[in-house]
């Protein structure tokens, strides 16, 4: 039996003969911009861009159903034009066109905002682009804008605006000595400004021998006033008021003195936590310091909250190291020796590509990154000792590691 006439749109046919008898063959080639869709018994078996397929007449039926479908470029995205939204009323197949509009605050540069779906399934190269601009930068609390042009609304990516912190404020992160007041922010690729900030200048805490004796109006921040109340005898002795004021340069305008009535010495520190040793070469008078040390090799003296013991320190707790205690004018030791404990110090093998269980805690900077795949230099965690469990003591615990970032928790992977 002869096969029906072979008709394929957007294709050229090359048949072995004009007859369509059993065994006759035709080669089907799609026109440029179209792809072959090959079906057998109505089931798609292949989709190919080229170059051709041969069909055979078998018992009155062509052995494959062939169609030439236009190439689909799919909806364009930011890879074609950054900061644009696209409209494709004609669809996204070969020959159709999409237009784009720039998303605020980006602006069109060029005049042809059309893309054409090309024969290779790619969009034509854009003849215009969306140039990102920043609006006027937002006000920075406690800072003055120094660049006049920055009050306008159009700023190219990469342009800067200069600010200066108001008196009594400084740029965070600048050193205590050189409290920087001027800073710049930059218009970034996504049309937003880099963040800038001004934080209040702070003074150093008063000497520890006055701990617990003073009250301050606003902590140790600029303009705060700290006061120790002395009995009236001080004034009659000509010592003046025991008040200090934090100045805008981060220094106190004076210093506290020990009130007349504050006399005596601290009690001998006893009932120390295990392995802790105090050495008090200058005795126990007000202002005397005792050096803290631990009897165990490579243990360190640290302060723990009242309810935490050395045995149950959670890995995320980063206790403060302490080197000395001071006898305050209130005749109390500061910090209180009962809060000082000895913990195992960090082994000196951080950042060496082995996850040392003993160092896998905040106190030891999570072994310098050796316990997380994202931070270990070799990108492979090797536990030490070898018996250490990668789900236990050698698990990735560092909260800063990529493994614990919000993105990862949502199932995204990082490139």
């Amino acid at each position: 039996t002869d096969c029906p006439e072979l008709a394929v749109e957007n294709a050229s046919l090359n048949c072995s003969s004009s007859d369509r008898y059993h065994g006759a063959q035709c080669t089907v080639s799609c026109r440029t911009g179209y792809v072959l869709q090959i079906r057998r018994d109505d089931e798609l078996i292949k989709s190919q861009t080229g170059p051709s397929v041969t069909v055979t007449c078998t018992e009155g039926k062509w052995n494959k159903q062939v169609a030439c479908e236009p190439v689909d470029c799919s909806i364009p995205d930011h890879h074609q034009v950054y900061a644009a939204s696209f409209s494709c009323p004609e669809g996204t197949t070969f020959g159709s066109q999409c237009s784009f509009q720039c998303r605020h605050p980006a602006q069109l540069k060029g005049n042809n905002s059309l893309l054409t779906c090309m024969e290779d399934g790619l969009w034509s190269f854009p003849e215009a682009l969306c140039e990102l601009m920043c609006l006027a930068p937002p006000p920075v609390p406690n800072a003055d804008l120094q660049t006049a042009r920055c009050r306008e609304n159009k700023h190219k990516v990469g342009s800067f605006c200069k600010y200066k912190c108001k008196p009594g404020y400084h740029v965070p992160g600048s050193s205590r000595k050189s409290k920087k007041r001027a800073f710049k922010t930059q218009c970034t690729q996504d049309g937003s400004w880099q963040e800038g900030a001004c934080v209040p200048v702070t003074c150093d805490p008063p000497p520890p021998k006055f701990h617990g004796l003073y009250q301050c109006t606003n902590g140790f921040q600029f303009n705060s006033e700290c006061r120790i109340k002395c009995e009236d005898s001080d004034a009659s002795q000509g010592l003046g008021s025991n008040v200090i004021h934090c100045r805008k340069d981060g220094t106190w305008n004076g210093s506290f003195h020990v009130c007349q009535e504050m006399q005596g010495q601290c009690s001998v520190p006893n009932e120390l936590n295990s392995n802790l040793k105090l050495q008090c070469p200058d005795g126990y008078a007000i202002g005397s310091e005792c050096a803290t040390s631990c009897l165990d090799h490579n243990s360190e003296s640290i302060i723990l909250p009242m309810n935490v013991t050395v045995r149950d320190i959670p890995h995320w707790l980063n206790p403060t190291r302490v080197e000395r205690v001071v006898c305050t004018a209130g005749l109390k030791w500061y910090p209180h020796p009962a809060l000082i404990h000895c913990v195992k110090g960090c082994e000196p093998f951080m950042g060496d590509n082995y996850c040392d269980a003993i160092n896998n805690r905040a106190f030891c900077n999570y072994d310098g990154g050796d316990c997380c795949t994202s931070t270990v230099k070799t990108k492979k965690v090797t536990p030490f000792p070898m018996s250490c469990d990668l789900q236990g003591d050698c698990a990735c615990r560092d909260p800063q590691a990529q493994e614990h970032s919000r993105k990862d928790l949502r199932g995204y992977s990082h490139g």
């Epitope: 490579n298 082994e347 000196p348 093998f349 951080m350 060496d352 082995y354 003993i358 030490f384 000792p385």
Partner: antibody, heavy 123, light 107 residues
Framework: EVQLVESGGGVVQPGRSLRLSCAAS????????MHWVRQAPGKGLEWVAV????????YYADAVKGRFTISRDNSKNTLYLQMNSLRAEDTAVYYC????????????????WGQGTLVTVSS | DIQMTQSPSSLSASVGDRVTITCRAS??????LNWYQQKPGKAPKLLIY???SLQSGVPSRFSGSGSGTDFTLTISSLQPEDFATYYC?????????FGGGTKVEIK
């Protein structure tokens, strides 16, 4: 060639100070923890001190704690041992040694040693 | 601190002999033990790490065994260049401690 070369030894009176240096070459010094190990004449090896790759962590043997200070200058590829309040029992050959962790399990070893420098504490 | 005890402190042997040196730790150290060889006037040299692994370049006549507290260094057939002092060292944790040494002398 991987090499450690100590210097700074000599004769010193009890109570005085001395600073030893160890110059490293042929490897990335700033990636390794380093040690000082000493050997009294005719005696065995005694570990003295260790310093982490970046100098942030230091530990000492009880016999030298509070008197000796280990330090390093990674820009100069040099390890130091500052020895104060020296005693007769500190007389020894002082070796610097590289701390290597051998794969795959990370065993701790002293894999490269210097030739040593002799410190004699005597009045 | 972990104490390391070596025995014997010295031994005399001939070329070709099988030599065994033992080392005992005051507490369990798993397999975290190294052996070093030191010749007169020279720096120590790492022979064996992890109780039994041979450091690269060290002849196969040297072998180590043991775990926990008891360890052994064996030289299967003593060669002239093997006359030296041998030290064990625990690498379980700071402070690193060495054994007192075993001097291998020519008989």
């Amino acid at each position: 060639e991987v090499q450690l070369v100590e210097s700074g030894g000599g004769v010193v009176q009890p109570g005085r100070s001395l600073r030893l240096s160890c110059a490293a070459s042929g490897f990335t010094f700033s990636s390794y923890a380093m040690h000082w190990v000493r050997q009294a004449p005719g005696k065995g090896l005694e570990w003295v001190a260790v310093i982490s790759y970046d100098g942030s962590i230091k530990y000492y043997a009880d016999a030298v704690k509070g008197r000796f200070t280990i330090s390093r200058d990674n820009s100069k590829n040099t390890l130091y041992l500052q020895m104060n309040s020296l005693r007769a029992e500190d007389t020894a050959v002082y070796y610097c040694a590289r701390h290597e962790r051998i794969p795959p399990w990370g065993f701790h070893t002293f894999d490269i040693w210097g030739q040593g420098t002799l410190v004699t504490v005597s009045s | 601190d972990i104490q390391m005890t070596q025995s014997p402190s010295s031994l005399s042997a001939s070329v070709g002999d099988r030599v065994t040196i033992t080392c005992r730790a005051s507490q369990g150290i798993s397999i975290y033990l190294n052996w070093y060889q030191q010749k007169p006037g020279k720096a120590p040299k790492l022979l064996i790490y992890g109780a039994s692994s041979l450091q690269s370049g060290v002849p196969s006549r040297f072998s180590g065994s043991g775990s926990g507290t008891d360890f052994t260094l064996t030289i299967s057939s003593l060669q002239p260049e093997d006359f030296a002092t041998y030290y064990c060292q625990q690498s379980d944790g700071t402070p690193w401690t060495f054994g007192g040494g075993t001097k291998v002398e020519i008989k």
